[in-house]
């Protein structure tokens, strides 16, 4: 008996004392466990275990299936085993034919046998195939052949377990390996759309994809800082060995305001985890926001091109859109086009063209769109810059010089003198008064300042200028003096 | 060649002590159960006592006549076996045989010439 | 102790002669049996091992049956060579005690 300190529990001792014994078939197996404390025996091969609370284990007429580890334990939970094989000429393996093997480990073929005196115990291919060139086992007769390091490669590898028994090789029923691929890259995922914009009591539903070698990827829907478990529905596909998709939907059957918030697909293996979001927006109506890409206060010279453009978001969908001028909508020389192609896009561009600007062009520009639930508006303020032209230059009965001119900006209107027929003049002349005519009118359009000048000042042949000009450019009109004695004979306006 | 050779028997008074060798060869003496067997002269054999493998945690057993009085020990580096026996008394007189277990079963498949041992005054 | 009792203890035969020999236990040792065959002067010989099994190299005139406590050693044809004293052993419980012997004798 082994050693122990007097008082100190010890194993059962078993009868017959070996470690391994081998019974013919048919025979009688016979184990005594000897111990004051004796509580069982139990039996196990492959997945089945069998109890015995006698002190003697008789199986009368051993079978192949006898065949297995025998154990003995008393009341201290100390044990001692036996493994029994039951020799039988007919049945060499005991096969549990299920085999998985995890890529990069070790897996167990499970063939043990009844008879561990017979050589040659080893992994054969099926059909007389070879093996895999790499492919390593360890032969064990009580446990099976363990397969070192499965690849990826053996995946549905046909197997025999085989020994040589009385100079004959003897082959297992066969065994198809499965192997399940390691995670060597954390899951793919992806969403259907990366943001929502619904209304109240619409459905909302959102479809993760997850991507893994295998099945056995763990995926599920989060709500952002919530715990709330969410109800989604699952497919899934094998693409070929080791190409494994799941699709995840998460439904909201009628959404309101308070599921806004950021939802997550998160998924993860051994090697790591992966997630994508998406943004859910929920209004309890549907909004249009306009954004105007210029000033809404637009200046531009005659004859030149400008372009009103905005931006919009509208959701729903937009669904009229026009421009006006002066209660007119343009049919032509506009475009609407969404912002994106993508397909939760809500934004939109609407540009008016409008080419070679007359001064009589200028005016309120009104942008106008509407969907199912609102309309929304904006306005452009267009004023056309125009050079000064002088509508009337006349001598008035009172003597007075007088200068009328239109143009936008506000005309100035600046007098000088030039005596003789220089027409380069450069004394100015202080004007009597000046007057806006139109300060009152539209507000956009021409602006018309009137500008006099006393002509009795003037004591010399010479030429008068009336120049009015603005930001644009500059016009002049002249009036020539000719004295006769005391008396002005002539006073000729040109221009 | 697969054997076992004894030694270590001869002359002992009663009381006294002797301690007998087997020396094996041939085969992995590590992994086997030993016994020692012994027989008195004219008479039928009788079973001394076993030690296990390492596999049987070196487990030693022996028959009532000798227990207490004879060890069994081992040194499987030297692939050797031993029987060291105390007190010795005449009716250990006896050729003693040292045998080798099978893997799989209790018998003796292997068995040495034997090395006499009297015990005498 | 288990005790093993063998009959005959010695019994005449002549060449060619049918032999058999038993081996009673005292409590069931199953099959957990074994014959020896021992001349004067050598170490025993192993016959049979597991109440039936016949070692490797034994002639297959030699062969042996029973279960439990009943035990047969049987010599089909006895040849010269045969003439010696038999042995059986119980190697259930230990201590692993040996039968008395039978010695077999020329006629």
């Known amino acids: 008996q082994p050693s122990v300190s007097p008082g100190e529990p010890s194993p059962p001792s078993i009868h017959p004392a070996k470690s391994e014994l081998i019974v013919r078939v048919g025979n009688e197996i016979r184990l005594l466990c000897i111990d004051p404390g004796f509580v069982k025996w139990t039996f196990e091969i492959l997945d089945e275990t069998n109890e015995n609370k006698q002190n003697e284990w008789i199986t009368e007429k051993a079978e192949a299936t006898n065949t297995g580890k025998y154990t003995c334990t008393n009341k201290h939970g100390l044990s001692s085993s036996i493994y029994v094989f039951v020799r039988d000429p007919a049945k060499l393996f005991l096969v549990d034919r299920s085999l998985y093997g995890k890529e990069d480990n070790d897996t167990l073929v499970r063939c043990p046998l009844t008879d561990p005196e017979v050589t040659s115990y080893s992994l054969k291919g099926c059909q007389g195939k070879p093996l895999p060139k790499d492919l390593r086992f360890v032969p064990d007769p009580k446990a099976g052949i363990t397969i070192k390091s499965v690849k990826r490669a053996y995946h549905r590898l046909c197997l025999h377990c085989s020994a040589d028994q009385e100079g004959k090789s003897v082959l297992s029923d066969k065994f198809i390996l499965k192997v399940r691929p390691a995670f060597k890259a954390v899951p793919v995922v992806s969403v259907s759309k990366a943001s929502y914009l619904l209304r109240e009591g619409e459905e909302f539903t959102v479809t993760c994809t997850i991507k893994d070698v295998s099945s056995s990827v763990y995926s599920t829907w989060k709500r952002e800082n919530s715990q709330t478990k969410l109800q989604e529905k699952y497919n899934s596909w094998h693409h070929g060995d080791f190409n494994y998709e799941r699709q995840a939907t998460l439904t909201i059957s009628s959404a309101r305001v308070n599921d806004s918030g950021v939802f997550m697909c998160y998924a993860n293996n051994t090697f790591g985890s992966a997630n994508v979001t998406t943004t859910l927006e929920v209004v309890d109506k549907g909004f249009i926001n306009i954004f105007p890409m210029i000033n809404t206060t637009v200046f531009v010279n005659d004859g030149e091109n400008v372009d009103l453009i905005v931006e919009y978001e509208a959701f729903p969908k937009p669904e009229h859109q026009q421009w006006i001028y002066m209660n007119r909508t343009f049919t032509d020389k506009w475009e609407d086009y969404p912002k994106s192609e993508n397909e939760s896009n809500i934004r939109y561009v609407s540009e008016l063209h409008l080419t070679r600007l007359k001064g009589t062009e200028g005016g309120t520009y009104t942008f106008l769109v509407s969907n199912s639930d609102v309309n929304a508006s904006i306005a452009f303020n267009v004023y056309v810059n125009t050079k000064p032209e002088i509508l009337t230059y006349d001598r008035l009965v009172n003597g007075m010089l007088q200068c009328v001119a239109a143009g936008f900006p506000e005309p100035t209107i600046d007098w000088y003198f030039c005596p003789g027929t220089e027409q380069r003049c450069s004394a100015s002349v202080l004007p009597v008064d000046v007057q806006t005519l139109n300060a009152s009118g539209p507000p956009f359009g021409k602006l018309v300042v009137q500008s006099s000048i006393d002509s009795s000042a003037f004591k010399h042949n010479g030429t008068v200028e009336c120049k009015a000009y603005n930001d644009v450019g500059k016009t002049s009109a002249y009036f020539n003096f000719a004295f006769k004695g005391n008396n002005k004979e002539q006073i000729h306006p040109h221009t | 060649e697969v054997q076992l050779v004894e030694s270590g028997g001869g002359l002992v008074q009663p009381g006294g002590s002797l301690r007998l060798s087997c020396a094996a060869s041939?085969?992995?003496?590590?992994?086997?159960?030993m016994d020692w067997v012994r027989q008195a002269p004219g008479k039928g054999l009788e079973w001394v006592g076993r030690?296990?493998?390492?596999?049987?945690?070196?487990?030693?057993e022996y028959a009532a006549s000798v227990k207490g009085r004879f060890t069994i020990s081992r040194d499987d580096s030297k692939n050797s076996l031993y029987l060291q026996m105390n007190s010795l008394k005449t009716e250990d007189t006896a050729v003693y045989y040292c045998?080798?277990?099978?893997?799989?079963?209790?018998?003796?498949?292997?068995w040495g010439r034997g090395t006499l041992v009297t015990v005498s005054s | 102790d288990i005790q093993m009792t063998q009959s005959p203890s010695s019994l005449s035969a002549s060449v060619g002669d049918r032999v058999t020999i038993t081996c009673r236990a005292s409590?069931?040792?199953?099959?957990?049996l074994n014959w020896y065959q021992q001349k004067p002067g050598k170490a025993p010989k192993l016959l049979i091992y597991?109440?039936?099994s016949l070692q490797s190299g034994v002639p297959s005139r030699f062969s042996g049956s029973g279960s439990g406590t009943d035990f047969t050693l049987t010599i089909s044809s006895l040849q010269p060579e045969d003439f010696a004293t038999y042995y059986c052993?119980?190697?259930?419980?230990?201590?692993?005690?040996f039968g008395g012997g039978t010695k077999v004798e020329i006629k």
């Open positions: 045998a080798r277990e099978p893997k799989y079963w209790i018998d003796f498949d292997l």
């Open positions: 041939g085969f992995t003496f590590s992994d086997a159960d």
């Open positions: 030690t296990r493998n390492k596999a049987g945690s070196y487990t030693t």
């Open positions: 409590q069931s040792i199953s099959s957990y």
């Open positions: 597991a109440a039936s």
């Open positions: 052993q119980q190697s259930y419980i230990a201590p692993y005690t």
